[in-house]
């Protein structure tokens, strides 16, 4: 029998080892053992949580996130005449979601096939880099959008080229920052072959030396710098925004804006509660437990939290809906299988028949689309 090496490895959650002994499978075939995981990690890697629940959630995210963010990006780039800062941030948000979601078919196949990665090391690194990159990009662009929304209420000045240029500059800086902070994820070997389970994992099993200190320090830094600080800014912007809206005079138009602002705040809050807070909190707790105890009892929660973090790609379109008039129109018409051009023509014909602009609405047999907002 061939002796395995004595290097050590560790499961993403707990202790895995490189066996220095020969390994005989249940079928009696002796093979060289390279990486090994403990019973808990093995049960997770072969269990329904990772092979059924995760692919179901990722399929939902892919089916909802790809078309909605694709449409959003198309609307923001080609169907929005004035490129306000909000539009620029939302376009970047949609792009970040798309860059993450396009890889989901590979992720779904990986989990369905028992956490077995067959697409090579480079694709695994791209998938993981984009996975985390999307989460932190979403947080930062959401922060920019939130601060910008507040700024618009405080400073309701017209659109200026300068503001758009600042927004583009900030967006480029965010992409550069995310690229830099995710470099470690691209550099680290993410694929590990586990002979005992006959699978090659992608990110689910990582070397012990890396896990014990480095991963904890890495995700703690990200949680503080790219989650807590932006979360504080976002929360501040919305608290101040609510104060401003409360104190402002209320006509019908202001009331609609206020309602949309509240819906936006609720959506962003939901995103933080469902997607960003659990994942960032559990990333830190999980790696802290590995560092301090050599094992993580919150592994299942950690997996679920990371999985739920991808739902931001489904929640983001609601943000676009509450912020962008153009996206709202396209979304409504896409859902009603109508082209915007048809609706615009009907609006024109309705107004030409001297219908009041305030109450102008287009009634179809199925629903009514208000066009006066």
């Amino acid at each position: 029998t061939i002796q395995g090496t004595n290097r050590s490895s560790k499961g993403r959650s707990l202790i895995g080892k490189v066996d220095g002994t020969s390994h005989v499978t249940g079928k009696g075939v002796t093979v060289e053992t390279v990486f090994s995981v403990d019973e808990f990690s093995a049960s997770v890697l072969t269990g329904k949580l990772t092979t059924v629940f995760l692919p179901i959630v990722y399929t939902i995210v892919f089916v909802v996130g790809l078309p909605s963010n694709g449409m959003a990006l198309w609307v923001f780039l080609f169907r929005t005449k004035k490129k306000h800062p909000a539009v620029i941030y939302m376009a970047n948000l949609a792009l970040a979601d798309l860059l993450s979601v396009i890889w989901f078919p590979l992720k779904i196949a990986y989990h369905i096939h028992g956490n077995n990665w067959i697409y090579g090391e480079a694709l695994c690194n791209v998938l993981i880099g984009f996975f985390y990159g999307n989460m932190y990009c979403s947080i930062l662009f959401m922060t920019c959008l939130s601060v910008q929304r507040y700024w618009v209420i405080v400073n309701p000045m017209g659109h200026s080229r300068k503001k758009a240029n600042i927004a583009i500059g900030i967006s480029l800086a965010i992409w550069l920052l995310i690229l830099l902070v995710t470099i470690p994820l691209y550099v680290v070997k993410q694929t590990i072959f586990i002979p005992a389970l006959n699978i090659t994992t992608c990110h689910d099993v990582l070397p012990e030396q890396l896990l014990v200190g480095d991963m904890f320090n890495y995700f703690l830094s990200l949680a503080i710098g790219v989650f807590l600080f932006p979360a504080f800014l976002t929360a501040s912007a919305y608290v101040l925004m609510i104060r401003m809206l409360r104190s402002s005079a209320m006509d019908e138009n202001s009331e609609k804006k206020r309602k949309r602002a509240i819906k936006l705040i609720v959506t962003v809050l939901a995103m933080y509660l469902i997607c960003f807070t659990p994942s960032n909190l559990l990333l830190v707790v999980h790696y802290f437990l590995i560092k301090s105890q050599g094992q993580s009892h919150v592994y299942a929660l950690y997996i679920v939290a990371l999985c739920l973090s991808t739902l931001n790609s489904c929640i983001d379109p609601f943000v676009y809906y509450f912020v962008s008039h153009d996206f709202r129109d396209h979304a409504k018409n896409a859902l009603l299988c109508r082209s915007v051009r048809t609706v615009k023509q009907m609006q024109v014909s309705l107004t030409s028949k001297k219908h009041s602009r305030k109450s102008s609405s287009y009634s179809s047999s199925s629903t009514t689309v208000k066009t006066s907002y």
Partner: antibody, heavy 121, light 107 residues
Amino acid sequence: EVQLVESGGGLVQPKGSLKLSCAASGFTFNTYAMHWVRQAPGKGLEWVARIRSKNVHYATYYADSVKDRFTISRDDSQNMLYLQMNNLKTEDTAMYYCVREDYYGSSYDYWGQGTTLTVSS
Amino acid sequence: DIVMTQSHKFMSTSLGDRVSITCKASQDVGSAVAWHQQKPGQSPKVLIYWASNRHTGVPDRFTGSGSGTDFTLTISNVQSEDLADYFCQQYSSYPFTFGSGTKLEIK
């Protein structure tokens, strides 16, 4: 309460065979990896063999000193662990302990009280 | 295989004293070290895992420390029931290996 009770030890002649048993109770036996560890009289502890759970296809591991002579097996329905020892040598004389591996891979967490094997002519 | 060396075969102490038992690994094992206590005529029991974490029910006078290659088990306020053999063990890689043991005695 976790309990591991070994049995089957005794006096055997060199080149003889013997099967040790370990009855497990107080935990979900089929989800844990199990080990045999031995301790020669007045000596230190030596790992002998390991068997994984069904999840990992009952994979088995052996120390070089017992490879091809000892076979570790388990019966999950009976909560039993076994060590079949063939072609015994005098240096196999020791106290044999049945040990549970921590579910999270953190070394061993429970030891049995041991059973004595004496190999002598 | 990784060799675990416990340089002191015996250590003498007085009741109520503090004693430190050391263990050295032949190569880096990270924090994957456990300490086992074996009282005369009994089977071993786990005291410490992952270098510094006490196993369930282990009194807090037992503390483990170290990482890499050097590890220490410290018993503060030694009690009569602590008189036993203490073995370190690495589980960084297979085969798991043990130190030769340190016998704690009363002066």
